[in-house]
């Protein structure tokens, strides 16, 4: 029963994690304009892996895709690759783990086959989670580096009179979604691997031994104690991630309703 619960829980946690990785990959808010210690602008910039967006204080939002492949920074390409690999591995892992679930009967599938599939999906979830965490962390590192570089020369004098203010970017919501989702996928994968150990049948087959007790004749046959109850057949797997949409007030820079600018 515990094995089934562990496997089922591992599957659900991984499912939520992979949904989160997909959401993070699609979100536009990987980096958002830093508003601290900056002149207050009526325009808010944010960027994702696939496009950059500008929202004016009027509410008008315009997004532009990165229509070049060769012109993009290598680090951004690497992050894209890591996230896609994470999603693909996670999706395959989910597919494999569905057939590996102990509560699902498929023909006369051996327990050893289910154990192998559980282990495979567990490893896939672990690698998927690591890919997502790595991707998000690489992007975060890139942001930190750029942030301090642009802080160092934030005001670039032009002829002494005119100043251009560089837009600095800080961590966007997608990074936190990605870290949490990657962590959940990783935890789910570990749970699947733990469940695999419980699923694997014992290698040593003991001969059945009869023990005669006074008054009762009970034969104890060790080796094949299986839980007959299915786990969570009516469990609802709810996707609880946010696809990246934000209202003006949620993302907007202004901390209070009354601002002096």
């Amino acid at each position: 029963m515990a094995v089934t619960a562990c496997q089922g829980l591992g599957f659900v946690v991984s499912l939520i994690g992979i949904a989160g990785i997909i959401a993070a990959t699609c979100m536009d808010q990987w980096s958002t304009q830093d508003l601290y210690n900056n002149p207050v602008t009526a325009v808010f910039n944010y960027q994702g892996l696939w496009r950059s967006c500008v929202r004016e204080s009027s509410g008008f939002t315009e997004c532009r895709g990165y229509f070049t492949l060769l012109g993009l920074p290598a680090m951004l390409q690497a992050v894209r690759a890591l996230m896609i690999v994470g999603i693909v591995l996670g999706a395959i892992g989910l597919l494999v783990s569905i057939f590996a679930l102990k509560c699902i009967r498929i023909g006369s599938m051996e327990d050893s086959a289910k154990a192998n599939m559980t282990l495979t999906s567990g490893i896939m979830f672990i690698v998927s989670g690591l890919c997502a965490i790595a991707g998000v962390s690489v992007f975060a590192n890139m942001l930190v580096t750029n942030f301090w570089m642009s802080t160092a020369n934030m005001y670039t004098g032009m002829g002494g009179m005119v100043q251009t203010v560089q837009t600095r970017y800080t961590f966007g919501a997608a990074l936190f979604v990605g870290w949490v989702a990657g962590g959940l996928t990783l935890i789910g994968g570990v749970m699947m691997c733990i469940a695999c150990r419980g699923l694997a049948p014992e290698e040593t087959n003991y001969k059945a031994v009869s023990y005669h007790a006074s008054g009762h004749s009970v034969a104890y046959k060790p080796g094949g104690f299986k839980a007959s109850t299915g786990f969570g057949s009516n469990t609802k797997n709810k996707k609880i991630y946010d696809g990246g949409a934000r209202t003006e007030d949620e993302v907007q820079s202004y901390p209070s309703k009354h601002d002096y600018v």
């Epitope: 002149p39 207050v40 009526a42 009027s58 509410g59 005119v162 100043q163 837009t167 309703k257 009354h258």
Partner: antibody, heavy 119, light 113 residues
């Protein structure tokens, strides 16, 4: 069609306050900013502040800090601008305007309200 | 605050001639995210409220005659009236709508020779 109708001209004494109204019609008000600006005689335009109808979010020009209060009554589609501690240099035409959906600038304007501060 | 400097303060042009008004900002109004400059041009006729002519430095407001055009990026902007008409007699203002508080130029009065 979009219309912003402002209240009539006012004559005020120094130290008193004035409250100018701006009634909007002809569009869905929620989600639009209403701006308040002023123009002193023979001078340029000065931005005072703005209110986002539907959310109550307000921004003020720090120059008018503590003297200007911008409010709105959603039920009557009316925005208000109150300027206190009036001085003779506050004599101006006060405008309300709507911030357009593109460009952060003001696409429709009220007809203006002349406020004269005189002892 | 951003300082907007317009030149000249007044301009006298013959009907049918070209009128050019310049506007400079103390900081760049160019947003790197969309490569748009947040500068607006307004026309104010005597006794009337201002009317938006051009936003994003070069986008003409619908209904504005095509003799009005805006150009420039960053800190230097120009409003051009290609062929001045009698009804163009007005004061023209440029506005920074990138940084709060929004600021205006002192205005350029266009008169007919």
């Amino acid at each position: 069609q979009v219309q912003l109708v402002q209240s009539g001209a006012e004559v005020k004494k120094p130290g008193s306050s004035v409250k100018v109204s701006c009634k909007a019609s002809g569009y869905t008000l929620t989600g639009y900013w209403i701006e308040w600006l002023r123009q002193r005689p023979g001078q340029g335009l000065e931005w005072m502040g703005e209110i986002l109808l539907g959310s109550g979010s307000i921004k003020y020009n720090v120059k008018f800090k503590d003297r200007v209060t911008i409010t709105a009554d959603e039920s009557t589609s009316t925005a208000y601008m109150e300027l206190s501690s009036l001085r003779s240099e506050d004599t101006a035409v006060y405008y309300c305007a709507r911030k357009g959906l593109r460009g952060n600038s003001f696409d429709y304007w009220g007809q203006g309200t002349l406020v004269t501060v005189s002892s | 605050d951003i300082v907007m400097t317009q030149s000249p303060s007044s301009l006298t042009v013959s009907l049918g001639e070209k009128a050019t008004i310049s506007c400079k900002s103390s900081q760049s109004l160019l947003n790197a995210g969309n490569q748009k400059s947040y500068l607006t041009w307004y026309q104010q006729k005597p006794g009337q409220p201002p009317k938006r002519l051009i936003y994003w430095a070069s986008t003409r407001e619908s209904g504005v005659p095509d003799r009005f055009s805006g150009s420039g990026s960053g800190t230097d902007f120009t409003l051009t009236i290609s062929s001045l008409q009698a009804e163009d007699l007005a004061v023209y203002y440029c506005q920074n709508d990138y940084y709060y508080p929004f600021t205006f130029g002192q205005g350029t009065k266009v008169e007919i020779k």
